[in-house]
Amino acid sequence: NKILVKQSPMLVAYDNAVNLSCKYSYNLFSREFRASLHKGLDSAVEVCVVYGNYSQQLQVYSKTGFNCDGKLGNESVTFYLQNLYVNQTDIYFCKIEVMYPPPYLDNEKSNGTIIHVKGKHLCPSPLFPGPSKP
C-alpha cells in the first residue's frame, strides 16, 4: 500500500527562491513522518528533510547545504528553498515516509517538479552606463 504524491510539473525561481508543495493521498495528522525533497533524476541529493512527530514541533534541516524551510498541512508538506543557484536547475522529487504508527508506509515515486532557477538580471548602473552610441 503506497502513498500517492502530487507536485507541480514545473516551477520557476525568479528570485532564487521557490515554494514546492508536496500533496499526499494520506493525512499526516498525529503521525510520525519523514518528508524529504531529492534533487536529480536518480534522487542522489537529499535537499531537505521535514520531520514531524505528534508530540513535538516540526524539525527541518538540510545535510547538503541548502537553505530550506518547511510547512505542514494535513495532507501536504511545502518546502521553501532560498538562495538557489542557476546551476541547481533540476528535477526535484518529493518523498514521504510514515514511521508510526505501524506499518511503515512510503510513496510511489512521483513525476517530480522541474525547478528552473532564473539568474538575477543585473540592471546597468547609471554610474556606468556602458559605451555611448556615436
Epitope: E32, F33, R34, V49, Y51, G52, N53, Q59, Y61, K63, G65, E97, M99, Y100, P102, Y104, D106
Partner: antibody
C-alpha cells in the same frame, strides 16, 4: 528505560561465521536505525553498517559489504549482525547503537558490546 | 568516504585544566559532527551532537564548536571522571566515520 542489550561473547575459528543479536526496548523500534560499530583491541571505532527496521533497508561500509549481513525481527524488536568468513583481524568488540530515522546524525544509545574472538 | 582526523592522539592533563581536542573532516560536513566519550571496557557515550549541542545529562563543562571542516571539543575544567578517550564522528553522509580518538590521561 531505553536499552539495547546484546548477546554474549563468542569464540570462533577462522573461516566460520558469527551472529550477534541486539534486543531493543523502551522505544518505538521502527523510529530508529540500528547501526553496528566495531572496535579492535586498543583501536578506534569502525562503522560496519545500519538497518532501518521499518522497511529493512540497509547501508553498509564497503569494507564489510560482502561479509556482513544485517537483519531485524520486528516482532521481537531485535537486530542481528552476521559476519562471515571470519579472520583473526575480526577479533573485536561489536556494538549496536541507534540513530533516529527522522533526525539521523548521532548515536544516542549503545549496547554493552559483544566480544568476538577469532582464533585457531 | 569522509576521513576524520583527530589531534592530538593523546594528551596529559591535570584536574582543573582546560583541554581542547580538534577534529578535521576531509570535506565540508557543515555542522554534522558529534563527540563521544569512551572509558575502558565500556560503550561510547554521546557528549555533543551537531557540533555544539550538549546531549541530555552531559555536564556543561563540555562544549563543542566549529563548522565546515574544523571542529573543537573543549573541557573547561577537567574532572577526575573525564579521563577517557574521546572520538569525533561525522553524521553528514554514509558511511559514517569516526576520528582515531584522543586519549586524555592524568599528568
Amino acid at each position: 528505560q531505553v536499552q539495547l542489550v546484546q548477546s554474549g561473547a563468542e569464540v570462533k575459528k577462522p573461516g566460520a561465521s558469527v551472529k550477534v543479536s541486539c534486543k531493543a526496548s523502551g522505544y518505538t523500534f521502527t523510529s530508529y536505525y540500528i547501526h553496528w560499530v566495531r572496535q579492535a583491541p586498543g583501536q578506534g571505532l569502525e562503522w560496519i553498517g545500519c538497518i532501518y527496521p521499518g522497511n529493512v533497508n540497509t547501508n553498509y561500509n564497503e569494507k564489510f559489504k560482502d561479509r556482513a549481513t544485517l537483519t531485524v525481527d520486528t516482532s521481537i524488536s531485535t537486530a542481528y549482525m552476521e559476519l562471515s568468513r571470519l579472520r583473526s583481524d575480526d577479533t573485536a568488540v561489536y556494538f549496536c547503537t541507534r540513530s533516529h530515522y527522522g533526525l539521523d546524525w548521532n548515536f544516542d544509545v549503545w549496547g554493552q558490546g559483544t566480544t568476538v574472538t577469532v582464533s585457531s | 568516504d569522509i576521513q576524520m582526523t583527530q589531534s592530538p592522539s593523546s594528551l596529559s592533563a591535570s584536574v582543573g585544566d582546560r583541554v581542547t581536542i580538534t577534529c578535521h573532516a576531509s570535506q565540508n560536513i557543515y555542522v554534522w559532527l558529534n563527540w563521544y566519550q569512551q572509558k575502558p571496557g565500556k560503550a561510547p557515550k554521546l557528549l555533543i551532537y551537531k557540533a555544539s549541542n550538549l546531549h541530555t545529562g552531559v555536564p556543561s563543562r563540555f562544549s563543542g564548536s566549529g563548522s565546515g571542516t574544523d571542529f573543537t571539543l573543549t573541557i573547561s575544567s577537567l574532572q577526575p571522571e573525564d579521563f577517557a578517550t574521546y572520538y569525533c564522528q561525522q553524521g553528514q553522509t554514509y558511511p559514517y566515520t569516526f576520528g582515531g580518538g584522543t586519549k586524555v590521561e592524568i599528568k
